[in-house]
């Protein structure tokens, strides 16, 4: 006869572990008892339970309420037991000793592995701003037993670095994702992927990237100078820029206050019917929490009575 068991039994924290011990022998043999003990190296054997053919299961006080026989139907040659609600401290070596007649006594060992699934956390790095060098975008930490695997899933170009801290019964893994911030990364997902044998599927935590930037400002509306003549209605200047966070716009006139009747509507400067009073240098001031930009234009309102056309300056300043 021989004992059938597993070299390693793997169970997730909190689940029940089946410790297998099946005596495969001549069917004329009788199994008298199966003794289970924990036999970690360097420590004396600690009795777990005794499974007696006549008197049933006796569980040692240290494991009271935690060791049971598998549910019926039961084979008299099966000495397997269930260890309820496995905890990390249960991880180790176990031995089953089977007393049979007339084949004699047999023993076998198995190792119980208790998997502790990780609970990952993602921490965003400092605020990302365009123009920075290599910057920490996010770090992801997961602790478990055995050590989890932490990787990144993203379309964004960057570099990763990992470090691991071993504890007595687990390991914590931290992975950092560094990148050179650019406006094209805005709104892009950066996903931390944690793999572990105790997880049915990978755990994923997604962080949306926010990169602060402010584009150069420019003014539209003076493309056709001939349209800027006395009496024209609906003339407007529009300030063009983009940024994160979205910028605010402010219009001023460099050579004096804004003429009466001129309306400021965010990025747009609306004019009443044009007069020569509207000629001047107008400045669009764009700003957000990250930066500010200016763009100025010179408006020269034409008098149709005058023969010669005048040139218009478009100056952009930052």
């Amino acid at each position: 006869g021989e004992l059938e068991t597993s070299d390693v039994v793997t169970v997730v924290l909190g689940q029940d572990a089946k410790l297998p011990c099946f005596y495969r022998g001549d069917s004329g043999e009788q199994v008298g008892q199966v003794a289970w003990a924990r036999v970690d190296a360097g420590e004396g054997a600690q009795e777990l339970a005794l499974l007696h053919s006549k008197y049933g299961l006796h569980v040692s006080p240290a494991y009271e309420g935690r060791v049971e026989q598998p549910p019926p139907p039961r084979n008299p040659l099966d000495g397997s037991v269930l260890l309820r609600n496995a905890v990390q401290a249960d991880e180790g070596e176990y031995e089953c000793r089977v007393s049979t007649f007339p084949a004699g006594s047999f023993q076998a060992r198995l190792r119980l592995r208790v998997l502790v699934p990780p609970l990952p956390s993602l921490n965003p790095g400092p605020a990302l701003e365009e123009g920075q060098g290599l910057t920490l975008a996010a770090s992801c930490t997961a602790e478990g037993s055995p050590a989890p695997s932490v990787t990144w899933d993203t379309e964004v170009k960057g570099t990763t670095s990992s470090r691991s801290f071993k504890h007595s019964r687990s390991a914590a893994v931290t992975s950092e994702f560094h990148l050179v911030p650019s406006r094209s990364m805005n709104g892009q997902p950066l996903t931390c992927v944690v793999s572990h044998p105790g997880l049915l599927q990978d755990q994923r935590i997604t962080h949306i990237l926010h990169v602060s930037f402010l584009a150069e400002a420019s003014v539209r509306g003076l493309e056709d100078q001939n349209l800027w003549h006395i009496g024209r209605e609906g003339a407007m200047l529009k300030c063009l820029s983009e940024g994160q966070p979205p910028p605010s716009y402010n219009w001023t006139r460099l050579d004096g206050p804004l003429p009466s009747g001129v309306r400021v509507d965010g990025d747009t400067l609306g004019f009443p019917p044009l007069t020569t009073e509207h000629s001047g240098i107008y400045v669009c001031h764009v700003s957000n929490e990250f930066s500010s930009r200016d763009s100025q234009v010179t408006v020269d309102v034409l008098d149709p009575q005058e023969d010669s056309g005048k040139q218009v300056d478009l100056v952009s300043a930052s």
């Epitope: 004329g28 043999e29 008298g32 007649f101 007339p102 004699g104």
Partner: antibody, heavy 119, light 106 residues
Amino acid sequence: EVQLQQSGPELVKPGASVKIACRASGYTFTAYNIHWVSQRHGKSLEWIGYIYPNNGGSGYNQKFMNKATLTVDHSSNTAYMELRSLTSEDSAVYYCAIFDYDEAWFIYWGQGTLVTVSA
Amino acid sequence: ENVLTQSPEIMSASPGEEVTMTCSASSSVSYMHWFQQKSTISPKLWIYDTSKLASGVPGRFSGSGSGKSYSLTIRNMEAEDVATYYCFQGSGSPYTFGGGTKLEIK
């Protein structure tokens, strides 16, 4: 108290058959294999085979395969061994036995049934 | 089948004497068991798993051995030890008994 009560002595003629009974009491009949052992006068013991009352499964010593047939009757908690085509060589005491475990192994035996084959 | 040969077939010893009988197997076995039988009554399991004493067996009895060679020893022979002792193996089918050692008292 566990007891294995065997049927009385048998005197049979050569070529005939005999059926020995072993009535079990004091334990769960289906829980143990019942083994049969023979002992010719002044000689050693010989294992014949066993039967498992739970499912009727049995195993034989090849030497007795064509000599002995083991059966059980659950209604009376009795195991039987039929011996056929008897010769004087089959004259012996036949024991039924169960292997039991408490703090240690021990064996319950029937008192033995003497079978004498004689013309 | 695994043939068990016991020796001596017959031996006698004085009270208080140490007695050793042997059992040799034709094939290696993991364990050997011993039975005691007095006259024609049913045999009793005496030693199991090579060296473990069955219930009620006096501590002066011991068993040892491995592989193909096993022995039973009585440290201080007593009159009640007069019997025939059979070795028995169950490591392989068919289970087999030795021919017996008859122990007498001088």
